[in-house]
Amino acid sequence: IWELKKDVYVVELDWYPDAPGEMVVLTCDTPEEDGITWTLDQSSEVLGSGKTLTIQVKEFGDAGQYTCHKGGEVLSHSLLLLHKKEDGIWSTDILKDQKEPKNKTFLRCEAKNYSGRFTCWWLTTISTDLTFSVKSSRGSSDPQGVTCGAATLSAERVRGDNKEYEYSVECQEDSACPAAEESLPIEVMVDAVHKLKYENYTSSFFIRDIIKPDPPKNLQLKPLKNSRQVEVSWEYPDTWSTPHSYFSLTFCVQVQGKSKREKKDRVFTDKTSATVICRKNASISVRAQDRYYSSSWSEWASVPCS
Amino acid sequence: RNLPVATPDPGMFPCLHHSQNLLRAVSNMLQKARQTLEFYPCTSEEIDHEDITKDKTSTVEACLPLELTKNESCLNSRETSFITNGSCLASRKTSFMMALCLSSIYEDLKMYQVEFKTMNAKLLMDPKRQIFLDQNMLAVIDELMQALNFNSETVPQKSSLEEPDFYKTKIKLCILLHAFRIRAVTIDRVMSYLNAS
């Protein structure tokens, strides 16, 4: 058993049918010595008397808020949560496996630049009685500071019969140098509590590996005289690290017909312009990627050919 | 990714082309190592990230772009120098700060070159003959060092009398390649910045 926060405790259980569970001793936080009784949650049934209460915690019916009283007055509370270990592996019931970029990916994180700011998000089908708390650091043995805000519900979508809820959090490394070469990964830890179930999820990454630039901005077309060709031009996104000559991007320009089946013409360039043939009803899209370290491509910025 | 490769303009900063080749070569070598050594811990998540140049060179700090000198987090405890304008020790007079940056890059290359050559000698003794260093990568390191045109003492190749542990050598190869790729990215950024200056 360990303390998650004041008066909230997590009991770790080897979870299998007929498991013996864990013996837990609760102590009433009071100078009083006698006339103390214990109850669980809203029930008025007295579970025991005395300054300490010994219980055998086996399943969720044994978890909850234990309260010690004296003469109708509440003295203190202890909330017991359960953390299930199933065949040597901690349970992952609360969050959905996003399966991207690989199986067992519960937390996904992205950064728009090298400033040390990043966003993480996760998915759940649970709508109520759910709380999250997020901590982060650079490295784990001698951790350096990363400050995270509160997790917020950022999106809701319907998937088949189920509603899916997306939560996200923004974090900022306390002292980040955009040019630094990372040798210790960022660690992100999310505590999730649903009713009386506790779970924790972690992710470990280098900022360089989670970079996803914003799409190029000010995408414009300039027709070339006496030609079907157009000059496409764009600019670096505002959120990208500066100076751009040091943090350079490379670009992919795509001409896509109205039908998804039509052949796509693609050109790669390090410049912020390109000459392409603009077909009728086609659209031109441009996306960006770090020129020197192949992390994710940005989303596409698009303009119609007409 | 397979991108069309642009050939540099003749007047281009001489080292940019070499540094781009270096990054391409080390990335290819790392990819090959990850595929060949699939049963070894060779991915970024599995290896320890060690920097053999730590406390010996200060490339990141010495080559910091002027715009980042206002960022206190970039100003380490070490004495930091900042690159200004100049070329790859070409015809124009190179500033002192610039020389510090480029000599730091040269020292990095020299250290990695020695490590890779020592390692290759060990890998050639492996009866499994599973993996060797790409000669192209070693050649590209050499070309960039020549373009940087610094004269420094030759570091003797380390020779080891004990029987090599091939498992450990292959894991060390992965660690070195990961670290060298990160340094090659920094070198490329620096060269690109200098080219634009």
């Epitope: 979870w15 299998y16 049918p17 399943e59 969720f60 199933e86 592996i89 | -």
Partner: antibody
Framework: QVQLVQSGGGVVQPGRSLRLSCAAS????????MHWVRQAPGKGLEWVAF????????YYADSVKGRFTISRDNSKNTLYLQMKSLRAEDTAVYYC????????WGQGTMVTVSS | SYVLTQPPSVSGTPGQRVTISCSGG????????VKWYQQLPGTAPKLLIY???QRPSGVPDRFSGSKSGTSASLAITGVQAEDEADYYC????????????FGTGTKVTVLG
């Protein structure tokens, strides 16, 4: 004590369907994940499928994906395996099993796919 | 499609020490716990070892398990006639959990 009693096995022609059941008692069935494991005659153990305690997630071996469906009825304390488009290579003893460091197995039920 | 490899058979005379190996990889045994099962003819498998080296109550102490790196092993110290059975190791793969990965199985024969 924990008990898993299986039923539903038998002889079936290729291409036909069969549903296996596993009735649980002696524990809070709705709190635990469950597996199906099979063993072809004279062969080793092969995992078939898994279902979460609340039925929210299901996982299948590639060899049965799209043909077999694992399900549970927590009000009846019963686990099911619906098998469709059966093939000769599905001939095996099928076991249900609890998920956990200490596990309990059903007695097994024989499924023979033969024309 | 078995990822955990066991020797097909091992044998020993009563009282001898018999060991069965189970070889896997970094993503399965290297990252997860190992179990061992005993299966007597015509019966369901019976758990012998869980958590690499833990014995459930009721399992004789002549059975012991261990794990090192990407391999695990089961030892029967002082093998007895009633130990003649098939033995299977089981683990998970970190990418496909909760799918069970079983070993190829080992037939233990007690001679004499």
């Amino acid at each position: 004590q924990v008990q898993l009693v299986q039923s539903g096995g038998g002889v079936v022609q290729p291409g036909r369907s069969l549903r296996l059941s596993c009735a649980a008692s002696g524990f809070t069935f709705s709190s635990y994940g469950m597996h199906w494991v099979r063993q072809a005659p004279g062969k080793g153990l092969e995992w078939v499928a898994f279902i979460r305690y609340d039925g929210s997630n299901k996982y299948y071996a590639d060899s049965v994906k799209g043909r077999f469906t694992i399900s549970r009825d927590n009000s009846k304390n019963t686990l099911y395996l619906q098998m469709k488009s059966l093939r000769a290579e599905d001939t095996a003893v099928y076991y249900c099993k609890t998920h956990g460091s200490h596990d309990n197995w059903g007695q097994g039920t024989m499924v023979t796919v033969s024309s | 499609s078995y990822v955990l490899t066991q020797p097909p058979s091992v044998s020993g005379t009563p009282g001898q020490r018999v060991t069965i190996s189970c070889s896997g990889g970094r993503s399965n045994i290297g990252s997860n716990k190992v179990k061992w099962y005993q299966q007597l003819p015509g019966t369901a498998p019976k758990l012998l070892i869980y958590g690499n080296d833990q014995r459930p109550s009721g399992v004789p102490d002549r059975f012991s398990g261990s794990k090192s790196g990407t391999s695990a092993s089961l030892a029967i110290t002082g093998v007895q006639a009633e130990d003649e059975a098939d033995y299977y190791c089981q683990s998970y793969d970190r990418g496909t959990h909760p799918a069970l990965l079983f070993g190829t199985g080992t037939k233990v024969t007690v001679l004499g």
